[in-house]
Amino acid sequence: EAHKSEIAHRYNDLGEQHFKGLVLIAFSQYLQKCSYDEHAKLVQEVTDFAKTCVADESAANCDKSLHTLFGDKLCAIPNLRENYGELADCCTKQEPERNECFLQHKDDNPSLPPFERPEAEAMCTSFKENPTTFMGHYLHEVARRHPYFYAPELLYYAEQYNEILTQCCAEADKESCLTPKLDGVKEKALVSSVRQRMKCSSMQKFGERAFKAWAVARLSQTFPNADFAEITKLATDLTKVNKECCHGDLLECADDRAELAKYMCENQATISSKLQTCCDKPLLKKAHCLSEVEHDTMPADLPAIAADFVEDQEVCKNYAEAKDVFLGTFLYEYSRRHPDYSVSLLLRLAKKYEATLEKCCAEANPPACYGTVLAEFQPLVEEPKNLVKTNCDLYEKLGEYGFQNAILVRYTQKAPQVSTPTLVEAARNLGRVGTKCCTLPEDQRLPCVEDYLSAILNRVCLLHEKTPVSEHVTKCCSGSLVERRPCFSALTVDETYVPKEFKAETFTFHSDICTLPEKEKQIKKQTALAELVKHKPKATAEQLKTVMDDFAQFLDTCCKAADKDTCFSTEGPNLVTRCKDALA
């Protein structure tokens, strides 16, 4: 229904706290360099204005669209051109072009320092002094580093953060209470960020149809007892919610997500028997819980899908009459029977089925042509299954750090032109798949591994798009989203690459490395490893292991030495010489 004042409508629906949080996220995601105080001031102004509209919907400007209101606020910021360069040109445009322009200027890799967590005492002091400001800082810092973070989900993580601080700041040993809990939230939030970015990429590059197909597969796996009409309704609503969030319409997105959660909880009987626990929770927790609810028990008996999709004499007629609906039912029927497959795999199977029908339904004897289609799925299914087995075996053998190194070598060989920091970040993230997925039960491994890898590779593609350097990466990133992971997996050593010259300074280390946290030490070593591969792309695993073991021994020795500086300056050059010899 139409409302006289959109801003009053959203303020009323969301309540002041969520309204303010979402406006802060929106501004932080659009203008990523502004300070918290600058954004907080704008948020307060917008909130005060929303209140006047709630009091009187026909007050001046209350009938304006949210894009107009927010865009006008952003464009009124002083020194916009000085701070943001060509983004200021967006302000010369009218809506909806202005908002599109802002979206295009979102930076997936902003040059901001890493978000450092203050030490426990300081954190608790500022939290106790002003919890609202403290949480505002959290929303601002996360949102500007992750400009596509799913806004209502970020409110959920802020709520988690709040609960952890409330609990731990009352403890004697604040540090040991906070650290593991906040690490857990950070890890989950980072995964949530790359997953959501993948959804927005799907929407931006391939449109709503592609996202809706993803949603149909995912929802059918989770709710195998829901009928196709129910799955379609949920997929349509979920697509709308994600379209809004990806498009920067965060108030509408959060409001519609709450509506969807309400609908699901009111219709549990036709959706799933597993929703009640989620539905008993307050709003943010409820929506989060529903988004990762366990799969419902499969129906006691389901037939094979061949009867409807291969053996039926009307296959081509049914397909021609309503292509998307027919393919949608195929995806639904296949997905509800296979919670053990990744969504990416299910979409590849549906794509193969579609291509087969396109080809066969134009032939003289269609049934003879498409009759073997289900058997032709075999290589598509076996490829990711083998990937999971190979990689999980390797992870179990090497552990997370060793597994990351193996992936780093592999990917540096595939795309040696990519910058070392990007390769290290990608390998570290890809390597976490072992810890995340390989310990799961057999039937959960494939969906976990492949859908996580796809999300990480999407980030690789986004970073590469900014500065394209590798034809291999461009090739894999240009294709469809579901083909990316198999494309990257199939890449081999880039034969066109001219090895980097050996520069001693790249492998020269100083005693300051000894005091770095373990994570930073690992990154330094992995940076050196990537550089080694760029110098010798065809080095064997044995050669690289020899060099890295030598390097680890050198660090261990010098960091234990009484005179660390002397050790580094005398032993360092020896290490460099040994490295060159080992790789010769």
């Epitope: 006691a300 008996d301 389901l302 037939p303 094979a304 899908i305 061949a306 029927e333 296949y334 029977r337 296979h338 919670p339 053990d340 497959y341 289900l374 058997a375 799925f377 075999q378 299914v381 076996e382 299954k385 039937d443």
Partner: nanobody, 123 residues
Framework: EVQLVESGGGVVQPGGSLRLSCAAS????????MGWFRQAPGKERERVVS????????YYADSVKGRFTISRDNSKNTVYLQMNSLRPEDTALYYC????????????????WGQGTLVTVSS
Amino acid sequence: EVQLVESGGGVVQPGGSLRLSCAASGLTFSSYAMGWFRQAPGKERERVVSISRGGGYTYYADSVKGRFTISRDNSKNTVYLQMNSLRPEDTALYYCAAARYWATGSEYEFDYWGQGTLVTVSS
């Protein structure tokens, strides 16, 4: 440890009948679709028939429709294959297999396999 043990194979004349059995252990039988596959000498393994978890649905290969019947007894953790009107081209090693998730009845969906039982149709 999951085990599937086939029995009932043997030599039979064309037009004759055989009943194969497959006893399963080490898995929750009623949670698995079951299937029979066969491999003739020098040929690829092929799908024969499969049956849904509850036994309400079956899916036959065209070559055996009307001659073979699959059934299961979940209380006995056993699946059966009644083979009538046997032909020389039915000669093969018959494998029993179990699939936790079942959509197409194709080989790649089956997680566990038996060692096979030999059926020879010859006059």
